[in-house]
Interface confidence: medium
């Protein structure tokens, strides 16, 4: 099928980096500046992403990809392959309405993205706090006080902080 | 195919409330940010508002900082714009959006329009 | 926030080329959206990133961005391409800012 497609088809055999220019007989034209064709086949090469404005550029176009964007210091990306950019706050705060702001006493927030998360309630697990929560850390739970004997062992780890999600715009 | 209708407009007098609601449908409405854009009779455009796809983040332009709030409910795919302390500034057509961003459409609802009078 | 400034009003004759400016700081180095919007209708975008078209626009419909200036550009323009159209620009963070409005009327 494939070889009976490129006989009908001179454009199949056109790489990827080249479009099937239809202006001159069907030949493989090279992508011009500035764009891209990440298949064969193509008609029509891509336009490549600009990273402007806070975003910045994670990986220069080529003319068989696109080019890819991060955010700028200060900016962490959201959405499917960083359709935007947010503002970081501070381990410590959440960035709410009114800009960053620090986390209300019994939550915590160990990253700069994200909303502070109320510290880990150890009594529910039958054990007491070890080392106190602050706005950046989650408390640590260490054994109930009947369990300290001899040989008792170890600190539960706090549990993994939860990324939240990202949409895009 | 993605869809937008806002609704709850309608005239109001200075100080007062009012709760506008934006029903989206042909997209997975928590996947995305969505915005509130407004336009004065016979003026331009200005950007209201933007929550993010979870509702964890809102932002606000000056004009309405302290008096709207955006909220959603992801479960019944609705947008929300809690406006109080209205004046006749206020007054204008309402639209829900899903604003361009890299890779994404650009999708607007018909608008609902908020009369601001005593 | 940046401002954005467009003339209030352009006119063209039919079959003429309108150009219809956006200006504000710097504003080649964000990205910058077009929209037509008729009487009594939502916004339609006709520009995204500065030069891109949404599909469904026609071809007569092209963009620039470039140093303080963004240029929507109108070929061959068309009884019903007469619309108010503004300017939108964005950095990739979350807020947006529009232009004031031009009025384009085909004489």
């Known amino acids: 099928f494939e070889r009976t497609r490129s006989l009908q088809d001179p454009c199949s055999n056109c790489p990827a980096g080249t479009f099937c220019d239809n202006n001159r007989n069907q030949i493989c034209s090279p992508c011009p500046p500035n764009s891209f064709s990440s298949a064969g086949g193509q008609r029509t090469c891509d336009i490549c992403r600009q990273c402007k404005g806070v975003f910045r550029t994670r990986k220069e176009c080529s003319s068989t990809s696109n080019a890819e964007c991060d955010c700028t210091p200060g900016f962490h990306c959201l959405g499917a392959g960083c359709s935007m950019c947010e503002q970081d706050c501070k381990q410590g705060q959440e960035l709410t309405k009114k800009g960053c702001k620090d986390c209300c006493f019994g939550t915590f927030n160990d990253q700069k993205r994200g909303i502070c998360r109320p510290w880990t309630n150890c009594s529910l697990d039958g054990k007491s706090v070890l080392v106190n929560g602050t706005k950046e850390r989650d408390v640590v739970c260490g054994p109930s006080p009947a369990d300290l004997s001899p040989g008792a062992s170890s600190v539960t780890p706090p549990a993994p902080a939860r990324e939240p999600g990202h949409s895009p715009q | 195919q993605v869809q937008l209708v806002e609704s709850g407009g309608g005239l109001v007098q200075p100080g007062g409330s009012l709760r506008l609601s934006c029903a989206a449908s042909?997209?997975?409405?928590?996947?995305?940010?969505m915005h509130w854009v407004r336009q004065a009779p016979g003026k331009g455009l200005e950007w209201v508002s933007v929550?993010?796809?979870?509702?964890?983040?809102?932002y606000y332009a000056d004009s309405v900082k302290g008096r709207f709030t955006i909220s959603r409910d992801n479960s019944k795919n609705t947008l929300y714009l809690q406006m109080n302390s209205l004046r006749a500034e206020d007054t204008a057509v309402y639209y829900c959006a899903r604003l361009y961003a890299q890779f994404e459409g650009d999708f607007w609802g018909q608008g609902t329009l908020v009369t601001v009078s005593s | 926030d940046i401002e954005l400034t467009q003339p209030p009003s352009v006119s063209v004759a039919p079959g003429q080329t309108a150009r219809i400016s956006c200006s504000g700081d710097?504003?080649?180095?964000?990205?910058v959206s077009w929209y037509q919007q008729k009487p009594g209708q939502a916004p339609v975008l006709v520009i995204y990133s500065d030069s891109e078209r949404p599909s469904g626009i026609p071809e007569r419909f092209s963009g620039s961005n470039s140093g303080n200036t963004a240029t929507l550009t109108i070929s061959g323009t068309q009884a019903e391409d007469e619309a108010d159209y503004y300017c939108?620009?964005?950095?990739?963070?979350?807020?947006?800012?529009f232009g004031g409005g031009t009025k384009l009327t085909v004489l």
């Open positions: 710097n504003i080649g180095s964000k990205y």
């Open positions: 042909g997209f997975t409405f928590s996947d995305y940010y």
């Open positions: 929550i993010s796809g979870s509702g964890s983040n809102t």
């Open positions: 939108q620009s964005w950095d990739g963070s979350i807020s947006r800012v």
